[in-house]
């Protein structure tokens, strides 16, 4: 009853619930994420507590400062939820829970290319498949280095397909796609696959 | 299969040491938590202390100071080692293991081993 | 230190019977939900039952119940069979002073 007390004798916004918190928010399995417990009272020492569901990871002491808590992502489990605790004396305030999502990357998408050759032009489908990494993956294809599609987003494990038409060329083109799904800054791209430039039977790619 | 294997109990004279042993199978020290749980001759149970997943640990008031919790992950052994034994930590000492991330669901438990303190 | 009293003590029933088992913590566990139900045979290591005050643990048959938040705590076993004639403990886990656990004083389940 007394610790109760106490704390109620707190008013709230003089010690409401802390903050916790991750720069990183999706990460893949191996990575090292840092979480921090914050809170708005700067003046009072507090003791931190990191909770995982019903686990107890660790418990830091901090004056104004936050309280990071360093932690690798290796298992599905440890996704969270999280929590932190604030304590001064008897009274103690929980934050809102947070959680990671946890993402497989990319693989190295494959481009295939299929050509329909007419006498002015080339039709060009592109198809961009990279067979592992968790979905949505957002693929982009690229000519000679430059974007020529935008992002398209595939929910599923199929590739994705981008059409083009030009005028029969006179030099090698370049084409490459690039897959990409939630992992910040973890994009993989495909080989490069070279379309000769036109000139008796040199297309490889087109249909007859 | 799953399992937890206690050791190490027997006869012990008032204010010696004795190190109980847990070893796991069929599962990685490294993932769950393992808690020691000990019950007197007629008794209920009784919680002596708990090592996580991070390997931290966790003790009942008691218990602190004259008993440690230690693993070998290597071995995937647990170990209690309780020093100054008087007549009434005489009991059977269980080793058990929680749910992940829930160190006090234990869904898991060794066979037990008796711990004996007379002189 | 935390106190888990358990009542009755003790109980003699029939099979068929409906039981219920209270379990009241001098501290609220954490989460509010922080608790377990074991039964233990004479001779055996205990089994678990019930997790987070109401989830009923892998192969426990549907005639045991929990439920409760807090500080208080029940266990039911809403037709008592042959096999159920045991003892029964609570589980809290607490995060008040360091983070802690305490078994409950226990109540055994006997044959009237």
């Known amino acids: 009853r007394k610790a109760v007390l106490d704390c109620e004798a707190m008013k709230t916004n003089e010690f409401p619930s802390p903050c916790l918190d991750s720069k990183t928010k999706v990460v893949m399995k191996g990575q090292n994420v840092s979480m921090f417990c914050s809170h708005k009272n700067k003046s009072l020492q507090i003791t931190y507590s990191l909770f995982r569901r019903k686990t107890h990871l660790g418990t830091q002491d901090g004056k104004g400062e936050p309280a990071i808590f360093n932690l690798s992502i290796t298992e599905a489990h440890e996704s969270g939820p999280y929590k932190c605790k604030a304590q001064v004396t008897s009274c103690s305030k929980y934050s809102r829970d947070f959680s990671f999502t946890i993402v497989d990357p990319v693989t190295s998408p494959v481009l295939n290319i299929m050509v329909i050759q007419t006498e002015t032009d080339r039709h060009i489908t592109l198809h961009c498949l990279s067979v592992n990494g968790s979905l949505p993956i957002n693929y982009t294809f690229f000519e000679n280095h430059v974007a020529i599609s935008p992002a398209i987003s595939k929910y599923d494990r199929e590739p994705a397909e981008f059409n083009l038409t030009k005028k029969n060329p006179g030099e090698e083109e370049e084409y490459r796609c690039e897959a990409k799904n939630r992992l910040p800054n973890y994009a993989t791209y495909s080989h490069p696959v070279t379309m000769p430039s036109t000139g008796g039977d040199s297309c490889p790619f087109c249909l007859k | 299969e799953v399992q937890l294997v206690e050791s190490g109990g027997g006869l012990v004279q008032p204010g010696g040491s004795l190190r109980l042993s847990c070893a796991a199978s069929?599962?990685?020290?490294?993932?769950?938590?393992i808690t020691w749980v000990r019950q007197a001759p007629g008794k209920g149970l009784e919680w002596i202390g708990t090592?996580?997943?991070?390997?931290?640990?966790y003790y009942s008031t008691w218990a602190k100071g004259r008993f440690t919790i230690s693993r070998d992950n290597s071995k995937n052994t647990v170990y209690l080692q309780m020093n100054s034994l008087r007549a009434e930590d005489t009991a059977v000492y269980y080793c058990?293991?929680?749910?992940?991330?829930?160190?006090?669901?234990?869904?898991?438990w060794g066979q037990g081993t008796l711990v004996t303190v007379s002189s | 230190d935390i106190q888990m009293t358990q009542s009755p003590s003790s109980l003699s029933a029939s099979v068929g019977d409906r039981v219920t088992i209270t379990c009241q913590s001098s501290?609220?566990?954490?989460?509010?939900?922080?608790l377990s139900w074991y039964q233990q045979k004479p001779g055996k290591a205990p089994k678990l039952l019930i997790y987070?005050?109401?989830r009923l643990a892998s192969g426990v048959p549907s005639r045991f119940s929990g439920s409760g938040s807090g500080t208080d705590f029940t266990l039911t076993i809403s037709s008592l069979q042959p096999e159920d004639f045991a003892t029964y403990y609570c589980?809290?886990?607490?995060?008040?002073?360091?983070?802690?656990?305490?078994f409950g004083t226990g109540t055994k389940v006997t044959v009237l």
């Open positions: 058990a293991r929680g749910y992940v991330d829930s160190d006090w669901y234990l869904n898991i």
């Open positions: 069929g599962f990685s020290l490294t993932i769950y938590t």
């Open positions: 090592i996580n997943s991070y390997g931290n640990t």
């Open positions: 501290e609220s566990v954490y989460d509010n939900n922080y």
């Open positions: 987070d005050a109401s």
């Open positions: 589980l809290g886990g607490y995060d008040s002073s360091g983070w802690y656990a305490a």
